[in-house]
């Protein structure tokens, strides 16, 4: 089996985590995709998911999490806006393939959110002053309760992020985007031990 690794991201309160999950294969384009948190010793908890079938370029918002699936480029964009210290924890993207287990990504995100230089949003000189407005036309999708027992791992302490109720609009200042990419292994390639060099030797773009 392929070892799941973690990458650590340190952000300040009020900033934005912007993740690209690279699912690559066309057969996954319309599949429902989810963003999960893995709490210490527990099963992964789905915080947000796309619709089923997943719609192209159609934002789905659950609280401060926005998912957007770009079928034509094989990318799921996950944004967690206005980060709070309580959002610290271990996260992953998965693709639902019922009745099979979800397809997991290689790298999980160990997110650490710390207090900013001051309690006032926008006071950080190093941050941009963009205001993100999430349009109220975004959709909240119903997520399956199904999680894979294989994904239970030891997560960092303080993995207590909960998702607030959906907001119709989010104004966000003090934004720093962290762009990263992740890889999926296709089930067939695993079976045939044909894991691509791209997947084995991928590079991360921050």
């Amino acid at each position: 089996a392929t070892k799941l690794t973690e990458e650590k991201y340190e952000l300040k309160e009020g900033q934005t985590l912007d993740v690209k999950c690279d699912y690559t294969l066309e057969k996954f384009a319309s599949s429902q995709k989810a963003w999960q948190i893995i709490r210490d010793g527990e099963m992964p908890k789905t915080l947000a998911c796309t619709e089923r079938p997943s719609k192209n370029s159609h934002p789905v918002q659950v609280g401060r999490i926005i998912l957007e699936d770009y079928h034509d480029h094989g990318l799921l964009r996950v944004r967690m806006v206005n980060l709070q210290v309580e959002d610290s924890g271990l996260y992953q993207c998965v693709i639902y393939q019922p009745p099979k287990e979800p397809h997991m990504l290689f790298d999980r995100i160990a997110l650490v959110v710390t207090k900013g230089f001051s309690g006032t949003p926008g006071s950080n000189e190093n941050s941009t002053q963009n205001v993100y407005k999430i349009p109220p036309t975004t959709t909240k999708a119903l997520c399956p309760l199904y999680t894979s027992p294989r994904t239970v791992t030891q997560a960092p302490p303080k993995s207590t992020a909960d998702v607030s109720t959906p907001d119709s609009e989010i104004n966000l200042t003090n934004v720093t985007d962290i762009i990263r990419e992740q890889k999926l292994i296709s089930e067939e390639d695993l079976e045939q031990k044909l894991i691509s060099e791209e997947d084995l030797h991928h590079h991360h773009h921050h």
Epitope: H73, L75, R77, L194, H205
Partner: antibody, heavy 121, light 111 residues
Framework: EVQLVESGGGLVQPGGSLKLSCAAS????????MHWVRQASGKGLEWVGR??????????YYAASVKGRFTISRDDSKNTAYLQMNSLKTEDTAVYYC????????????WGQGTLVTVSS | DIVLTQSPDSLAVSLGERATINCRAS??????????LHWYQQKPGQPPKLLIY???NLESGVPDRFSGSGSGTDFTLTISSLQAEDVAVYYC?????????FGQGTKLEIK
Amino acid sequence: EVQLVESGGGLVQPGGSLKLSCAASGFTFSTYAMHWVRQASGKGLEWVGRIRTKSSNYATYYAASVKGRFTISRDDSKNTAYLQMNSLKTEDTAVYYCTRDMGIRRQFAYWGQGTLVTVSS
Amino acid sequence: DIVLTQSPDSLAVSLGERATINCRASESVDTFDYSFLHWYQQKPGQPPKLLIYRASNLESGVPDRFSGSGSGTDFTLTISSLQAEDVAVYYCQQSNEDPYTFGQGTKLEIK
């Protein structure tokens, strides 16, 4: 090991037709889009077109220079991609390569050795 | 269509010296800061070989003297220390939108 083997090339008169085949092995053929790329002698590479997978309804895309004359198809049960070339012109003379990408809009990691198509009277 | 223009058309560099090839796109080949621009090497009588994918990622098995950089419309392939076996034609290619396109190629020779 991934292998792509082209066949079907040869000499054909202008206005004629030819069908190229690309036999694939070493990977799950149905999972990936397949492309054709050509190269005239001493010239650069030209992307001819691609065919996507069943989950994308086998959608096809072509370069403007071949649109309406060339047709790409695939038979997943035979692990084979095809390039049907009609109304051939002398400028279609080239080595034709079959390539496999690494996924949606990803790079061409695997290439066949190519098959030569000569259009001449 | 996105036009890729490589420069120079040909290049002669001494063994052990740095070789730089540029590729300019007529419009951005990025989606979310994710550049769908790749580099290939082709030697006479052989099919092209992938060197760099998505602007800066080294393909497995390719010597680390090869590197790629750039985003948006401007990209560079660099060979840090030219070796005799690097003599070839180099192509950039974009897959951000259909139709996919290649640059016209840059011929690299030993000075």
